[in-house]
Amino acid sequence: YDFTNCDFEKIKAAYLSTISKDLITYMSGTKSTEFNNTVSCSNRPHCLTEIQSLTFNPTAGCASLAKEMFAMKTKAALAIWCPGYSETQINATQAMKKRRKRKVTTNKCLEQVSQLQGLWRRFNRPLLKQQ
């Protein structure tokens, strides 16, 4: 999906109002400095591409974050503010339901969510140059 035509300001507002709190809840006191940031993004569409990938695609050591509250709210925000996004996700959602597993918060998942927080920061502060 091409995120170029999304309403970035509305997505930013959704992050700051709810998604950020759900990510912090998931991290449960784990500090962002406890992990190295290995994923980055260069502009807002790129950030959303990386956010979608880390949020919804299973990775080694972290089977699925897609059923977490922050993921569901991310999905809703993208569906509302990115034209045509929901249509592209129907097949992916059906496949994900077949793979659904018991939720376990592993250290790898905490690291992945920490990466997500970094990507969201970059999305929300696109004009701030990386130091």
């Epitope: 950020s20 912090i24 449960s28 940031n37 969201w120």
Partner: antibody, heavy 123, light 112 residues
Framework: QVQLQESGPGLVKPSGTLSLTCAVS?????????WSWVRQPPGKGLEWIGE???????NYNPSLKSRVTLSVDTSKNQFSLRLSSVTAADTAVYYC????????????????WGQGTLVIVSS | DIVMTQSPLSLPVTPGEPASISCRSS???????????LDWYLQKPGQSPQLLIC???DRASGVPDRFSGSGSGTDFTLKISRVEAEDVGVYYC?????????FGQGTKLEIK
């Protein structure tokens, strides 16, 4: 608004145990904050003692770790400091402080402090 | 532990004039996320410390814009563009990259 209030004895005997409590109002101690203790000897600088999360997870300053115990009481919305085997060098103003997360999971910002309580170690 | 060193330790300033305080850390405070975990606090006489700047350059809520933080890695600066009488007190830098959090020795700003 968020307020923190330290309480405890102002005088402790050498080799005794210093015990302080920080009562939190305007915020739930079970929110996603770390809660710290910082001390300041008279006329000197600030020293971080340690921190506790509502789950009971702790981080301590290694220089004090063998003598410090932090605890949290979510039902009373307060957290406590115990410092054992005290000497005159532990005489200081003791502050409790809130370390609230940023929108991106950053910690390390003490945005609210108690007014401090002076503890003197003397016989 | 990360050692924080401030200079000068004493800073007499005329009201309306600028002021600058330096803080140096024994190791880099720049995280891989691109942010510096360095705070500035002001402790006014007889009061508790108050947060001025976090992440090296982000002003805390309610802090006047005459205060600004800059720097990266191991060298940081707090600038006051025009000192006011209410700015007197001791300024501390603190590293928040790792525990134990450590403070600089403090810089006492006084009015000439």
């Amino acid at each position: 608004q968020v307020q923190l209030q330290e309480s405890g004895p102002g005088l402790v005997k050498p080799s005794g145990t210093l015990s302080l409590t920080c009562a939190v109002s305007g915020d739930s101690i079970s929110n996603y904050n770390w809660w710290s203790w910082v001390r300041q000897p008279p006329g000197k600088g600030l020293e971080w003692i340690g921190e506790i999360y509502h789950s009971g997870r702790t981080n301590y300053n290694p220089s004090l770790k063998s003598r410090v115990t932090l605890s949290v009481d979510t039902s009373k919305n307060q957290f406590s400091l115990r410092l054992s085997s005290v000497t005159a060098a532990d005489t200081a103003v003791y502050y409790c402080a809130r370390d609230a997360p940023s929108d991106y999971g950053d910690y390390g910002f003490f945005d609210h402090w108690g007014q401090g309580t002076l503890v003197i170690v003397s016989s | 532990d990360i050692v924080m060193t401030q200079s000068p330790l004493s800073l007499p300033v005329t009201p309306g004039e600028p002021a600058s305080i330096s803080c140096r850390s024994s190791q880099s405070l720049l995280h891989s996320n691109g942010y510096n975990y360095l705070d500035w606090y002001l402790q006014k006489p007889g009061q508790s410390p108050q947060l001025l700047i976090c992440l090296g350059s982000d002003r805390a809520s309610g802090v006047p814009d005459r205060f600004s933080g800059s720097g990266s890695g191991t060298d940081f600066t707090l600038k006051i563009s025009r000192v006011e009488a209410e700015d007197v007190g001791v300024y501390y830098c603190m590293q928040a990259l790792q525990t134990p959090y450590t403070f600089g020795q403090g810089t006492k700003l006084e009015i000439k």
